[in-house]
């Protein structure tokens, strides 16, 4: 998870737009039973901020502590704030549970900004607006940390919903997930609508609105319109995808697909912006520029520094294209696009100084470690971490902010040959040589 | 109410380095990019660079590439400015100033001597 | 680098007139310039952006406008309080850059 560029909340529009219903899946297999259909208690159970990320409600231990936990894609530790810091409100208190268990451990985590770091143990958890559940998981309790917590962003731990492969310290420390599908029936699978605001709230705003829901061990049919197409799950480790084409309003970038998966294309909960790699994100730029270009945006617009403004109630979204992610299917050389509106890569932004008029920045950036579909790309759709079929599915959110004119499409199949080699093969290490 | 509080008034011997310090409060700190200005009796006011508080990502004025360097603490949300081998040409007005739409918000002020 | 150029240095006017400050970019710079009022000792104050856009709480004595390279500050009803240096600024393109500023006399 790109920590420090974190995530956006709820939308103005709800509902399917206009009617739209997307082409049904011809080849969908059937369902399982018990994987689709209602999850009430659990719909609803997220909340956020622009730029700090979706958390849900989660308690640890016995009795009980309450705690707000982010919910992350892009990482695998369950991890709680277990010290006072100036930026928590309250944080688990190891000593207060009859349930806890030391495993005499210390774990550390550095990022490429900041770092936190704790003592391993086990204990009891459960989410209320989840599953009927409580399992015993691995938590990280965090007694030191820097420019991890968030001021004002209401959460005090972080559970890193990815693979065994990215856990620290090693893959040997089961993630929170992997624990709950071993100890519960519940089956291994859950699903993310991240709702984006389209508008900025303050904080008590925030305190009162709903951010989405994650529906733990199965699809909720209420969050999404149309039909949910699948791409394969590359590796287990990140939830890393392949993505064999990208336009901007329907204008191909023309690049060799290696290069959008340099060196890896993840879907990261934890991470705001859409993030493409150098190559990626300057012709990206290039060609969204080409297409807006009524207006002339301030450099420091592009790269994420300046805020751009219009009227209240007045802004041209019509003149910012759509952008589109081709991303592999299940099926050989088939593939399907998912596709973003302005109102998604534009994140409203509340500045006191100018709160006349609606205000927006530039919610794609420049990534050194591969693609990062971040919560820009995940308030547009329903997302479906199907762990026990190796796939991620995406459908439209009924949530995601949109105006009469278009809507963000998941649409398919199309034929695109050799997407094997869109994949970049990250060189592995190899141990034997780092002997002495 | 935003504010970008600076650090005080500073006399240094030429050759010697300082470092100068903002401190932002009223809004949430990694939302937008913190900027440094040099004004100079008649010389007007000279943007020396920026920094993104939420990644510490900078972009610099070429002028002051080798003479300013920004760095952040997002656990107190401050930003500083470490200016190295002072001259009198570095004899100025600094300011912080709080991106947004250009600059909404500035800092109070501090006054860099360098004198022997 | 872009230069920005207020010609006039000074300008000299009486309470309840109106005086008008330009600024004249080297290249066009869209409508990405902003003015800002710097009293004697203090800090600039952010007055306009987006070339015409107040900022909250500026008076609407104060207007801006032009577009591409020529823009305008224009300050109505002078008051005594208006006695200032003024600096017209371009966040067009990196590095930003200022006007040498013009400074508002009160007779």
């Known amino acids: 998870t790109q920590h420090g560029i974190r995530l956006p909340l709820r939308s103005g529009l709800g509902g399917a737009p206009l009617g739209l219903r997307l082409p049904r899946e011809t080849d969908e297999e059937p369902e399982e039973p018990g994987r689709r259909g209602s999850f009430v208690e659990m719909v609803d159970n997220l909340r956020g901020k622009s730029g700090q990320g979706y958390y849900v409600e989660m308690t640890v231990g016995s009795p009980p502590q309450t705690l707000n936990i982010l919910v992350d894609t892009g990482s695998s530790n369950f991890a709680v704030g277990a010290a006072p810091h100036p930026f928590l409100h309250r944080y688990y208190q190891r000593q207060l549970s009859s349930t806890y268990r030391d495993l005499r451990k210390g774990v550390y985590v550095p990022y490429t900004q900041g770092k936190w770091e704790g003592e391993l143990g086990t204990d009891l958890v459960s989410i209320p607006h989840g599953p009927n559940v409580t399992v015993r998981a691995n938590i990280a309790a965090i007694t030191e940390s820097d420019k991890f917590f968030i001021n004002g962003s209401n959460w005090e731990g972080i559970l890193g919903l990815a693979y065994a492969e990215i856990a620290r310290p090693d893959d040997s420390l089961e993630p929170f997930f992997d624990s709950l599908v071993k100890q519960t029936h519940v089956p291994n699978l859950f699903s993310l609508q991240l709702c984006g605001a389209g508008f900025p709230l303050n904080q008590s705003e925030v305190l009162a609105s709903v951010g989405g829901s994650m529906i733990i061990g199965g699809i909720d049919h209420s969050l999404y319109t149309g039909s949910l197409w699948y791409t394969p799950i590359r590796r287990e480790w990140y939830y890393e995808v392949i993505i064999v084409r990208v336009e901007i309003n329907g204008q191909d970038l023309k690049m060799d697909c290696k290069e959008y998966n340099y060196d890896k294309s993840i879907v990261d909960s934890g991470t705001t912006n859409l993030r493409l790699p150098k190559k990626v994100f300057e012709a990206a730029v290039k060609s969204i520029k080409a297409a807006s270009s009524t207006e002339k945006f301030p450099d420091g617009f592009w790269l994420g520094e300046q805020l751009v403004c219009w009227q209240a109630g007045t802004t041209p979204w019509n003149i910012f294209p759509v952008i589109s992610l081709y991303l592999m299917g299940e099926v050989t050389n088939q593939s399907f696009r998912i596709t973003i509106l302005p109102q998604q890569y534009l994140r409203p932004v509340e500045d006191v100084a100018t709160s006349q008029d609606d205000c927006y920045k530039f919610a794609i950036s420049q990534s050194s470690t591969g693609t990062v579909m971040g919560a820009v790309i995940m308030e547009g759709f329903y997302v479906v971490f199907d762990r026990a079929r190796k796939r991620i599915g995406f459908a439209v959110s009924a949530c995601h902010v949109h105006d009469e004119f278009r809507t963000a499409a998941v649409e398919g199949p199309f034929v695109t040959l050799d997407m094997e080699d869109c994949g970049y093969n990250i060189p592995q290490t190899d141990e034997s040589t780092l002997m002495t | 109410e935003v504010q970008l509080q600076q650090s005080g008034p500073e006399l240094v011997k030429p050759g010697a380095s300082v470092k100068l310090s903002c401190k932002a409060s009223g809004y949430t700190f990694t939302n937008f990019w913190i900027h440094w200005l040099k004004q100079r009796p008649g010389q007007g006011l000279e943007w020396?660079?920026?920094?993104?508080?939420?990644?510490?990502?900078?972009k610099y004025n070429q002028k002051f590439k080798a003479k300013a360097t920004l760095t952040v603490d997002t656990s107190s949300s401050t930003t500083y400015m470490h200016l190295s081998s002072l001259t009198s040409e570095d004899s100025a007005v600094y300011y912080c100033?709080?991106?947004?739409?250009?600059?909404?918000?500035w800092g109070q002020r501090t006054l860099v001597t360098v004198s022997a | 680098d872009i230069v920005m150029t207020q010609s006039q240095k000074f300008m000299s006017k009486s309470v309840g007139d109106t005086v008008s400050v330009t600024c004249k970019a080297s290249q066009d710079v869209g409508r990405n310039v902003a003015w800002y009022q710097q009293k004697s000792g203090q800090s600039p104050k952010s007055l306009i952006y987006s070339a015409s856009h107040r900022y909250s709480g500026v008076p609407d004595r104060f207007t801006g406008s032009g577009s591409g390279t020529d823009f305008t500050l224009t300050i109505s009803n002078v008051q005594s309080e208006d006695l200032a240096d003024y600096f017209c600024?371009?966040?067009?393109?990196?590095?930003?850059?200022f006007g040498g500023g013009t400074r508002l006399e009160i007779k």
């Open positions: 100033a709080r991106s947004g739409v250009a600059f909404p918000y």
């Open positions: 020396i660079g920026m920094i993104d508080p939420s990644d510490s990502y900078t």
């Open positions: 600024q371009q966040y067009n393109s990196y590095p930003y850059t």
